[in-house]
Interface confidence: low
């Protein structure tokens, strides 16, 4: 009886009709940059204020007839999806609409820029509560549009945009490619990526998450009580704008970085059939479908992390790729990946006062990706400790020697074109968890962080026989901060984090005999923050009987490490 | 925005001295870049967003826009300033011939110029 899309974004064990109160999102204002809208539609009447902003190009074609219902169609539907009485996500959110798309759904980059500037000026003149800006539009990659989005985001505005309906890499489009914007792809009732005619939803590393975007029932501009089904990444973005409004209404102080991390954290994981995406995009595309959090509060104690992939380095010998975290995030680890396996590892380095993750291509390689693990860790003080290649045959090792610093990630980088296999694999001595080890010809980089209550442990999973993929996951209550492979030999394609699982990929089994050089160990560093837990508990009071602290005390950490001896 | 097409004579006279001086010459070695949409059918040649360096004030943006108009007028080109940006990015939106791009890229404070392009409802 309730539309599938509203059911889908409701957390398990909750009923959508009871979960979405009539004032959900009421502290938030959502700006919609789209077509004109039918503001007296029953779904949105009294909820949407039509601003006097209009900047649209002339319609194409001499025989074009301006028909009000057609002109208003796209915007009216989206306003309904965000805040409609019946079919809306955030039924209490108030909206303001700006007309930047004409009756054919076409606008300009310049018109959109002027619209964004209008929002910024409105915000300065009359500061209100949290602002969400919905951009259900896309054009080709635009440096200036991305820059404007970045500035608005840095002014505290949450921007949500459509990934695009071109069945293509979202990084080729704007504003979808702007890192500060929350970019949303579309999935259907079967959690499949949405196909739209011969095209479909965009994908790739510039997409933050997916949301319902096919057969979405919402307000139709044909009459004031009409409803219609529409599909597209605009509809998906409207769902996320609504979810963002709900979250911000519950926690108005959330920063953009915190909101993005929560959107990712509360999403349904690994439900999308990746076979729909081109093979080279599967690893880059997040397998996440947006959902509302199970309760409005209580997420604050968790250590939130996300994985950020760089652009592809390109194939030149000295090519590098750089992955960056958002300004409010900490880079806790850095890894790399190459489909050909030809890479020279990765390193964390300072750039403009912030750590970035840089991956290095190798001669004959088709290029590499850098993969950053970006986390929310307030009051963190992180540094990188480096050990040059070791002289001895034991391999290189580096540890966190400063008092109170814990190891959050390990990276290794080598200058030689091909690392020889390294037998036997280096075993970490018991009782020394705070150290990274690697190949003797590689320099090793340890990410060492001090933050109140931060504790980490190392978890390994080794496979003696060659296997294309080795994984190790952090258990409930712990967050994956670091993911790397032991040893860093040439048949390892790389390592990367998927949600809370560390994935190490190796060359096709058939190319690496079954000798010990096929052996691979995936190394995960799992962390949690007792400080965040305590702060959250203080905020909520001790209403829950036994507090989180007691739970943590009962689970005193033991530094268990399972060492796999390969024969 | 009022039509400024009739103001060239006055602008040329007013800006001649400023233009000939080196007070606001672009810094040595920093060249502004030009960008346009990779998807040809979506390009909108003839309209350009001139983005100025980050700390540029509104008055400098307006002065740079007038300077472009004056220099264009001296070369016999009509231009129209459609919008002056401030608040998010400093710069201006100008309707002009693509022939003037080389000239515009050499203006003081210019960071980059982007040709306007289409966006579409998704």
């Amino acid at each position: 009886s309730i539309p599938w899309n509203l059911e889908r974004i409701t957390p398990p064990r909750y009923r959508a009709d009871e979960y979405q109160p009539p004032d959900g999102g009421s502290l938030v204002e959502v700006y919609l940059l789209d077509t004109s809208i039918q503001s007296d539609h029953r779904e949105i009447e009294g909820r949407v204020m039509v601003t006097d902003f209009e900047n649209v190009p002339e319609e194409d074609g001499t025989r074009f007839h301006r028909q009000a219902s057609k002109c208003d169609s796209h915007g009216t539907h989206l306003a309904g999806v965000v805040s409609g009485r019946d079919a809306g996500v955030a039924k209490g959110a108030s909206m303001r609409s700006l007309r930047v798309l004409n009756c054919q759904g076409k606008g300009t980059v310049s018109g959109t820029l002027i619209g964004l500037e209008f929002i910024r000026k409105s915000q300065l003149v009359q500061p209100v509560g949290p602002l969400v800006v919905l951009l259900p539009l896309a054009g080709g990659y635009s440096r200036v549009l991305n820059a404007a989005c970045q500035r608005l985001a840095r002014a505290g505005v949450v921007l949500v945009t459509a990934a695009g309906n071109f069945r293509d890499d979202a990084c080729l489009y704007s504003p979808a490619s702007a890192p500060e914007v929350i970019t949303v792809g579309a999935t259907n009732a079967q959690d499949q990526p949405v196909t739209l005619g011969t095209l479909g939803t965009n994908f790739g590393r510039c997409v933050d998450l997916f949301a319902p975007g096919e057969d979405i029932i919402g307000a139709s501009s044909d009459c004031s009580t009409c409803f219609v089904s529409q599909s597209g990444t605009s509809q998906a973005a409207a769902h996320v704008a609504g979810i963002a409004a709900m979250m911000l209404s519950a926690e108005p102080e959330l920063t953009l970085a915190e909101l993005r991390q929560r959107l990712i954290h509360f999403s349904a994981k690994d439900v999308i059939n990746e076979a729909w995406f081109p093979e080279d995009q599967r690893v880059l595309t997040p397998n996440l479908v947006a959902a509302l959090p199970p309760s409005t509060h209580g997420a604050g104690w968790q250590l939130f992390c996300r994985t950020v992939w760089s652009a592809h380095s390109g194939p030149t010998r000295m090519a590098t790729a750089v992955a960056r975290c958002a300004p409010d995030e900490e880079l806790l680890s850095c890894s790399s990946f190459s489909r050909s396996g030809k890479r020279r590892g990765e390193r964390m380095e300072a750039q403009g006062g912030k750590l970035v993750c840089r991956a290095h291509n190798a001669f004959g390689g088709e290029g590499v990706y850098a993969i950053a693990r970006c986390c929310l860790l307030p009051q963190a003080n992180c540094s990188v400790h480096t050990a040059p290649p070791a002289e001895a045959s034991m391999g290189t090792r580096v540890h966190c020697h400063q008092q109170g610093h814990v190891l959050t990630g390990c990276s290794s980088h080598w200058e030689v074109e091909d690392l020889g296999t390294h037998k036997p694999p280096v075993l970490r001595p018991r009782g020394q968890p705070n150290q990274c080890v690697g190949h003797r010809e590689a320099s090793i980089h340890a990410s060492c962080c001090h933050a109140p209550g931060l504790e980490c442990k190392v978890k390994e999973h080794g496979i003696p026989a060659p296997q294309e993929q080795v994984t190790v996951a952090c258990e409930e209550g712990w967050t994956l901060t670091g993911c790397s492979a032991l040893p860093g030999t040439s048949h390892v394609l790389g390592a990367y984090a998927v949600d809370n699982t560390c994935v190490v990929r190796s060359r096709d089994v058939s190319t690496t005999g079954s000798t010990s050089e096929g052996a691979v160990t995936a190394v995960a560093i799992c962390c949690r923050s007792r400080h965040l837990a305590q702060a959250s508990q203080e905020l909520q009071g001790s209403t829950s009987g036994s507090g989180l602290n007691d739970i943590f005390e009962a689970q005193k950490i033991e530094w268990h490490e399972h060492h796999h001896h390969h024969h | 925005q009022e039509d400024e097409d009739g103001d060239y004579e006055e602008l040329v006279l007013a800006l001649r001295s400023e233009e000939d001086g080196l007070a606001e010459a672009p810094e040595h070695g920093t060249t502004a870049t030009f960008h346009r949409c990779a998807k040809d059918p979506w390009r909108l040649p003839g309209t350009y967003v001139v983005v100025l360096k980050e700390e540029t004030h509104l008055s400098q943006s307006e002065r740079t826009a007038r300077r472009l108009q004056a220099q264009a007028a001296r070369r016999g080109y009509l231009t129209k300033i459609l919008h002056v940006f401030h608040g998010l990015l400093p710069g201006f939106l100008v309707k002009m011939s693509g022939d003037l791009l080389e000239l515009a890229l050499k203006l003081p404070h210019v960071d980059y110029i982007e040709e306007d392009s289409s966006v579409f409802a998704q």
């Epitope: 009886s1 109160p21 009539p22 004032d23 009447e45 009294g46 009485r85 019946d86 009580t225 209404s249 | -």
Partner: antibody
């Protein structure tokens, strides 16, 4: 004038279904949600759910979710409530009531006269 | 679900008396966007359908005599009849519409 006229009394056996109608007149049917409320003998009022005639969307109280179906026929401005797998404790007066479809008007300003449904073997 | 608790469940009074019925909700009914309390009061006479008296906690429905008034905000609400008339003897229900709809159990007002 505005009125909601409900169908007549019904006597049903346990396990059967009942379908009650509510015909609206004197106003634009699509502009108001139609709610159904029941009242067992000597008891209070119990909200069952609603239908939005313009969209056909329904929301049901969880106590009835598996057994109730609300529908409408906009061509004759009539709403229907069907309750299946009847039990003796479903014996009650069933009311339809309208609510203006506007987010500040969450109250029922016009009610039907009620339909008595008796479930007895 | 939001629970609605009315008190008293019954009361006896005489014509001309001032009568107060209270209603408590298990969570706030104040809609933060509209600044309105989503609470209504209904009157029901035997064998009849309920009739709307008050909505938004304190707004009288048109045609309802001004001796009926509603007050309160958040979780505590009151229906007051300033001077009882013979036709006022009935059962009164409060109802929340903040999240779906729930009625109070009713207050039966009888002649003393």
């Amino acid at each position: 004038q505005v009125q909601l006229v409900q169908s007549g009394a019904e006597v049903k056996k346990p396990g059967a279904s009942v379908k009650v109608s509510c015909k609206a007149s004197g106003y634009t049917f699509n502009d108001y949600w139609m709610h159904w409320v029941r009242q067992a003998p000597g008891q209070g009022l119990e909200w069952m759910g609603y239908i939005n005639p313009s969209s056909g969307f329904t929301k049901y109280h969880q106590n009835f979710k598996d057994r109730v179906t609300m529908t409408r026929d906009t061509s004759i401005s009539t709403a229907y409530m069907e309750l299946s797998r009847l039990r003796s404790d479903d014996t009650a007066v069933y009311y339809c009531a309208r609510q203006y479809d506007y987010d500040e008007d969450w109250y029922f300003d016009v009610w039907g006269q009620g339909t008595t449904v008796t479930v007895s073997s | 679900d939001i629970q609605m608790t009315q008190s008293p469940s019954s009361l006896s009074a005489s014509v001309g008396d001032r009568v107060t019925i209270t209603c408590k909700s298990s969570q706030s009914l104040l809609n933060s966007r509209t600044r309105k309390n989503f609470l209504a009061w209904y009157q029901q006479k035997p064998g009849k359908a309920p009739k709307l008296l008050i909505y938004w906690a304190s707004t009288r429905e048109s045609g309802v005599p001004d001796r009926f008034s509603g007050s309160g905000s958040g979780t505590d609400f009151t229906l007051t009849i300033s001077s009882l008339q013979p036709e006022d003897f009935a059962t009164y229900y409060c109802k929340q519409s903040f999240n779906l709809f729930t009625f109070g159990q009713g207050t039966k007002l009888e002649i003393k």
